[in-house]
């Protein structure tokens, strides 16, 4: 049986935290790190659809970023494999109501953290 901390939501052996507050991309990742988590890594269409369903009407940062002229990478350093399109010309990715887009790192948005669930 999988379990997640209070205020976290479980889906397919992962736990997700949807923020109430807004922060820039860097501060959002710092928060996730403080919870032994990272900004969300989206590994399947099912996971993407789950996040889109649960995030509500606000944009939410996820754990994808890129250096200028470089490919998108997840927080753990693995390259993004183009599972879904990312619109926009920003360096950090977020989820909107239809999918993923990108914006400058200093803009403030809600965020989603993810980590492996706890098996009990």
């Amino acid at each position: 049986q999988a379990a997640c901390p209070e205020s976290w939501i479980g889906f397919q052996r992962k736990c997700f935290y949807f923020s109430d507050d807004t922060k820039n991309w860097t501060s959002s990742q710092r928060f996730c790190d403080s919870q032994d988590a990272d900004l969300a890594q989206v590994e399947s269409f099912q996971e993407l659809n789950f996040l889109l369903r649960y995030k509500g009407p606000s944009d939410h940062w996820i754990g994808l970023s890129r250096e200028q002229g470089q490919p998108w990478k997840w927080i753990n350093g693995t390259e993004w494999t183009r599972q879904f399109p990312i619109l926009g010309a920003g360096e950090c990715a977020y989820l909107n109501d239809k999918g993923a887009s990108s914006a400058r790192h200093y803009t403030e948005r809600k965020w989603i953290c993810s980590k492996s669930d706890i098996h009990v």
Partner: antibody
Framework: QVQLQQSGPGLVKPSQSLSLTCAIS??????????WNWIRQSPSRGLEWLGR?????????DYAVSVKSRITIKPDTSKNQFSLQLNSVTPEDTAVYYC???????????WGQGTMVTVSS | ETTLTQSPGTLSLSPGERATLSCRAS???????LAWYQQKPGQAPRLLIY???SRASGIPDRFNGSGSGTDFTLTINRLEPEDFAVYYC????????FGQGTRLEIK
């Protein structure tokens, strides 16, 4: 179709609290594909979003920075409605107040009839 | 907070003409979260366009939205007498903000 019916007083004294209610028919306040908002309109400030409540496995509230310290929006699942409370009002809070539905990614598609609220002694 | 600036403030045209209304955002807005509304005196705003370019239910096809990033446009082809009103743009991706409005009046 979805309809929103507003109720509440049209006159409030300065420093008191403004309270309005919005009754929902044709949808649920607990819907996981909608958010329920309060928006106001005045000649001086134009259309101004005040805040919203919505349910996604738990209840969330988002408030505009301009009113964050004195606003509360609450859902009432038993009556399928949501309410606005704005504390410490001043004449600058005089406006037409609207309750609205934001339907997932489809914009603010349903508006209440509007309530003209005057703040005056 | 994203600021939306609409231009022109007032647009004077005749029925049958084309109206082009502009909305510029202070920072990039997700195209999925940009809407246009029409408001007539004494009425609540009415949703015309959502997702920058999708027409709301019951909206005639002479109303068209376009744009992305920071620049968005509402075009009304073949103006009808009932189209003369005030038009607002709105972003709803990160809280919500409205433009100050464009008044479309009969020339």
């Amino acid at each position: 179709q979805v309809q929103l019916q507003q109720s509440g007083p049209g006159l409030v004294k300065p420093s008191q609290s403004l309270s309005l209610t919005c009754a929902i028919s044709g949808d649920s306040v607990s819907s996981n594909s909608a958010a329920w908002n309060w928006i106001r309109q005045s000649p001086s400030r134009g259309l101004e979003w005040l805040g919203r409540t919505y349910y996604r496995s738990k209840w969330y509230n988002d408030y505009a920075v301009s009113v964050k310290s004195r606003i509360t929006i609450k859902p009432d699942t038993s009556k399928n409605q949501f309410s606005l409370q704005l504390n410490s009002v001043t004449p600058e809070d005089t406006a037409v107040y609207y309750c609205t539905r934001l339907a997932n990614s489809d914009g603010v598609d349903v508006w209440g009839q509007g309530t003209m609220v005057t703040v005056s002694s | 907070e994203t600021t939306l600036t609409q231009s022109p403030g007032t647009l004077s045209l005749s029925p049958g003409e084309r109206a082009t209304l502009s909305c510029r955002a202070s920072q990039s807005v997700s195209s999925n979260s940009l809407a246009w509304y029409q408001q007539k005196p004494g009425q609540a705003p009415r949703l015309l366009i959502y997702g920058a370019s999708s027409r709301a239910s019951g909206i005639p096809d002479r109303f068209n939205g376009s744009g992305s990033g920071t620049d968005f446009t509402l075009t009304i082809n073949r103006l009808e007498p009932e189209d003369f009103a005030v038009y607002y743009c709105q972003q709803y991706g990160n809280s919500q903000t409205f433009g100050q409005g464009t008044r479309l009046e009969i020339k």
